[in-house]
């Protein structure tokens, strides 16, 4: 049985092999139970967490993780050296920077040590699983009487990231958003001097160095303009 799993992380080619033992048709052995799916995310290309839902096991099981890189110099099978735990049961593995090869096919294998034939293998494209740190050091400057420019920094190579800027005033119910490319600069051409604006930014590893779907966390917000909270009932909700 070879099952293709459409994962929510852009790795449509991830395949999982479930190894079955021979058995009577009226009973299922433990080795037929599917293993949980492994989800990996690479945080700012500094470390990677590969995690699974340990509570999906019928009984508490310390599943083990092995990994290697397909068709590369790094194709030797490696054991996880830093397990993550949930209620004293293995629920993930953390890999350090030197173990991460973004542009080679990463193969991860989960196994039940009590039932070695019960194992599942997935292939992942790590360049599609990078989540950058949130943008930092947001600054606003006035370009003209009515125009504002928002700048920010990222702790990664600028051209590898795209960004989403959101802004709203005290009086807005919802955010207005604007996509921004690797130049990490945003201009708001028409600013109302009577309103207070809030801006925030998030970033994504896409499209020049990878094709990640997941955004970073939002930056800390930055504000501009007069504080009109006395007149405006929406401001408290905005700050909450």
């Amino acid at each position: 049985l070879n099952t293709t799993i459409l994962t929510p992380n852009g790795n449509e080619d991830a395949t999982t092999d479930f190894f079955l033992t021979s058995m009577p048709t009226d009973s299922l052995s433990v080795s037929t139970l599917p293993l949980p799916e492994v989800q990996c995310f690479v945080f700012n290309v500094e470390y990677m967490n590969c995690t699974w839902n340990s509570s999906s096991e019928p009984q508490p099981t310390n599943l083990t993780l092995h990994y290697w890189y397909k068709n590369s110099d790094n194709d030797k099978v490696q054991k996880c050296s830093h397990y993550l735990f949930s209620e004293e049961i293995t629920s993930g593995c953390q890999l350090q920077k030197k173990e991460i090869h973004l542009y080679q096919t990463f193969v991860v294998q989960l196994q039940d040590p009590r039932e070695p034939r019960r194992q599942a293998t997935q292939m992942l494209k790590l360049q599609n699983l990078v989540i950058p740190w949130a943008p930092e050091n947001l600054t606003l400057r006035k370009l003209s009487e009515s125009q504002l420019e928002l700048n920010w920094n990222n702790r990664f190579l600028n051209h590898c990231l795209e960004h989403l800027v959101q802004y709203r005033t005290d009086w807005d119910h919802s955010w207005t958003e604007q996509s921004v490319d690797y130049r990490h600069k945003f201009s708001l051409p028409s600013v109302d001097g009577q309103k207070r604006y809030t801006f925030r930014v998030r970033s994504r590893f896409n499209p020049l160095c990878g094709s990640a779907q997941h955004w970073s966390e939002w930056s800390h917000p930055i504000h501009w303009g007069s504080n009109s909270s006395k007149e405006n009932p929406f401001l408290f909700a905005l700050e909450a």
Epitope: Y103, Q104, F156, L157, N158, L208, C209
Partner: nanobody, 125 residues
Framework: QVQLQESGGGSVQAGGSLRLSCTAS????????MGWYRQAPGNECELVST???????YYADSVKGRFTISQDNAKNTVYLQMNSLKPEDTAVYYC???????????????????WGQGTQVTVSS
């Protein structure tokens, strides 16, 4: 803030030499692949040479045997030694930084304006 600052360009006679330098800041230099691109007026951005974090190098056919790329991790600097320069080497040269493994396993077209301002190299005959 990620920054790449090129220097060392200038005007030189054909057959002469120049050494370009690129100082990097704001990212982990020794964990990145570095490269040099160039763009002549009216031409596309062209990859000239790369050096990977493991020290492996690449050269475009047009510069093989004449250009040498190197890096100094302690100084966060990558160099391009250009010898036997030809008029067709005239261009703005840009320093580039990529995630580790990009050049050897991924690749893809780049625009020269992704990085710094570049440094002008002019070779006259």
């Amino acid at each position: 803030q990620v920054q790449l600052q090129e220097s060392g360009g200038g005007s030189v006679q054909a057959g002469g030499s120049l050494r370009l330098s690129c100082t990097a800041s704001g990212f982990t230099f020794d964990d990145s692949d570095m490269g040099w691109y160039r763009q002549a007026p009216g031409n596309e951005c062209e990859l000239v040479s790369t050096i990977s974090s493991d020290g492996s190098t690449y050269y475009a056919d047009s510069v093989k045997g004449r250009f040498t790329i190197s890096q100094d991790n302690a100084k966060n600097t990558v160099y391009l030694q250009m010898n036997s320069l030809k008029p067709e080497d005239t261009a703005v040269y840009y320093c580039a930084a990529e995630p580790r493994g990009y050049y050897s396993n991924y690749g893809g077209r780049r625009e020269c304006n992704y990085w710094g301002q570049g440094t002008q190299v002019t070779v006259s005959s």
